[in-house]
């Protein structure tokens, strides 16, 4: 049973219609209204990801027997990263806890490939999703989530790590992308913009949404995050776009109401456990999937991204609270904490539903260039 929330059936970009149609071009602003990021110059010439940070740079996943009993992931794979080139960022470098990725920030020096060579890899995230070009894969079954409805106790740690707000999740949250593709949730965090400026990481036909939630998971084939980094399918992220709706989202309010307590970079608080699945869209059957990377250093590849077709609705006040409460380093607001979209470089985005079939009058012949390659493997 989920906490009540807005727009359970709103499609991507579909406003508050409540209809569950796949996203159509007519729902999106024109390209002039929301310019797409340019690809980072010379990216193809940069070194690959052979030199991933060693395991000493990465936090371990604590076993349940250790104090707090929660998976520790505070400073790594938080799947975050730098904004549009035309929107220079003023904020957010890492917590000062001594790992090799501790000095990156959004929209400025040092260049990320210098922080972690993997950031120059060919299969990076986030990406622009073009539903018309997505490969429909009937083998992509509805996601399965187990144990996501957490009781109020034990409490969870909510932290401002200087580049996002992150909720550390306890053991026991299991997620399956399909048979034999099982994961456990580690943490969730958000990406957002600023007043009047959207801040999702992924885009759809160039359209950027107000915000985006990421729930980061570790494959059950691995005991620790550092073992999984860079391994195909080692990590999986569930991503959902957050949009403005007419009512307050009570699930998100349980987190947003606590942001003032962690306004300062590096601060943290404890929040009662909540229904984590209530932070996600209700339709687990319609999504896009592709293989990419963490969206912040170390930018490790092999991450399976699942981006929901349905959006989650928050009130205007809630979106404002998200983008206007937290502070990053150097007395700067923590805003616009998203990375520019990265080139697909031949990757095919798969869809669990026929996203390329558009009912719009403007789309007489759906373009379905790609075929499903390996869904469900």
């Amino acid at each position: 049973q989920r906490l009540p929330r807005m727009q359970e059936d709103s499609p991507l970009g579909g406003g508050s219609s409540g209809e569950d149609d796949p996203l159509g071009e007519e729902d999106l602003p024109s390209e002039e209204d929301s310019p797409r990021e340019e690809d980072p110059p010379g990216e193809e010439d940069l070194p690959g990801e052979e030199d991933l940070p060693g395991e000493e740079d990465l936090p371990e996943v604590k076993p349940k027997s250790e104090e707090e009993g929660s998976l520790k992931l505070e400073d790594l794979p938080t799947v975050e990263a730098p904004g549009d080139p035309q929107e220079p960022q003023n904020n957010a470098h890492r917590d000062k806890e001594g790992d090799d990725q501790s000095h990156w920030r959004y929209g400025g020096d040092p260049p990320w490939p210098r922080v972690s060579p993997a950031c120059a890899g060919r299969f990076q995230s986030p990406v622009d999703i073009r539903p018309q070009l997505a490969a429909f894969c009937p083998a992509l079954r509805p996601l399965e989530l187990l144990g996501f409805q957490l009781p109020p106790l034990p409490e969870l740690r909510l932290r401002n790590n200087g580049h996002s707000v992150q909720l550390t999740l306890p053991p026991g949250l299991e997620m399956a992308l399909g048979p034999g593709r099982e994961y456990r949730a580690l943490q969730l965090h958000l990406h957002w913009g600023a007043a009047g400026r959207p801040g999702s990481e992924h885009t759809v036909e160039g359209h950027r949404f107000p915000a985006e939630i990421h729930v980061v998971h570790l494959s059950t084939a691995f005991a620790r995050v550092d073992e999984a980094l860079g391994r195909p399918g080692g990590l999986a992220v569930l991503a959902a776009f957050l949009e403005e709706g007419p009512e307050e989202n009570s699930a998100y309010e349980q987190l947003l109401s606590r942001l003032e307590e962690i306004a300062e970079e590096g601060s943290e608080t404890q929040v009662p456990g909540l229904d984590i699945s209530a932070l996600l869209p209700s339709d687990f059957s319609r999504y896009f999937q592709y293989e990419g990377s963490l969206t912040t250093p170390p930018c490790a590849q092999g991450v399976i991204w699942t981006v929901f077709n349905q959006t989650v609705m928050l009130s205007a006040k809630q979106l404002h609270t998200l983008s206007d409460t937290l502070w990053g380093p150097g007395d700067s607001r923590l805003q616009l904490n998203f990375r520019a979209t990265q080139p697909l470089n031949g990757r095919v985005i798969e869809a669990s539903f026929p996203a390329g079939v558009d009912s719009s009058p403007r789309a007489a012949e759906p373009v379905q260039l790609n075929s499903c390659l390996a869904a469900g493997d």
């Epitope: 049973q1 989920r2 906490l3 009540p4 104090e67 707090e68 409805q149 009781p151 109020p152 106790l153 034990p154 409490e155 009570s250 349980q254 608080t269 404890q270 929040v271 009662p272 456990g273 909540l274 229904d275």
Partner: antibody, heavy 124, light 107 residues
């Protein structure tokens, strides 16, 4: 026998201060989150504040009506809970109960042990 | 804050009657609801936790049910010593909130 005994209530003028104490016995005090709940004359129950246990860093939480004026604290060595009340208002007049909350082995916020209460009267 | 609405605010019943009190919550709280009994001049006592679990030492005539936003508290056979005010309380998130109370009297 599990027991909570409050003390420190009394009559105080608006703007004044008072410190309530609660002595706990019969259970492992250090394991538990501890709360203050109050009840204005003829009214219902209102949660005021709680303080977490040692394992959770002793961090406090307050209701909006008392935040910035009241401070909850504890001394595990004395099995004692405290509520320092400053800038008291007439609407703070109530019976204040010391209450035991959850612990590491529970998964739910409920109040299973209550003290007998101590009366705080704020009046000019 | 989560709002709790109890009904009725007062009720009168006879010994042996089945008595039911309801608690409506402003948002989904799963099963994180407790019921308390408070007799005049005394501290409240926990009766039911997690919507339906009977606290240690509480007579079996007391029961609770419900989940989400609507909860019910029942006394299967009212006894004279049950005269009290009953409160529901949510434990989903803080600030923890109580219902306004239901005063139970004997006819």
């Amino acid at each position: 026998e599990v027991q909570l005994v409050e003390s420190g209530g009394g009559l105080v003028q608006p703007g004044g201060s008072l410190r309530l104490s609660c002595a706990a016995s019969g259970f492992t005090f250090t394991d538990y989150y501890m709360h203050w709940v109050r009840q204005a004359p003829g009214k219902g129950l209102e949660w005021v504040a709680f303080i977490r246990n040692k394992a959770s860093g002793y961090t406090p939480q307050y209701s909006a009506s008392v935040k910035g004026r009241f401070t909850i604290s504890r001394d595990d060595s004395k099995n004692s809970l405290y509520l320092q009340m400053n800038s008291l208002k007439i609407e703070d007049t109530a019976v204040y109960y010391c209450v035991r909350g959850g612990h590491a082995g529970s998964n739910y916020w409920y109040f299973d042990v209550w003290g007998q209460g101590t009366t705080v009267t704020v009046s000019s | 804050d989560i709002q709790m609405t109890q009904s009725p605010s007062s009720l009168s019943a006879s010994v042996g009657d089945r008595v039911t009190i309801t608690c409506h919550v402003s948002q989904n709280i799963n099963v994180w609801l407790s019921w308390y009994q408070q007799k005049p001049g005394k501290a409240p006592k926990l009766l039911i936790y997690q919507a339906s679990n009977l606290h240690t030492g509480v007579p079996s005539r007391f029961s609770g049910s419900g989940s989400g936003t609507d909860f019910t508290f029942t006394i299967s056979s009212l006894q004279p010593e049950d005269i009290a005010t009953y409160y529901c309380q949510q434990g989903q998130s803080y600030p923890f909130t109580f219902g306004q109370g239901t005063k139970l009297e004997i006819k």
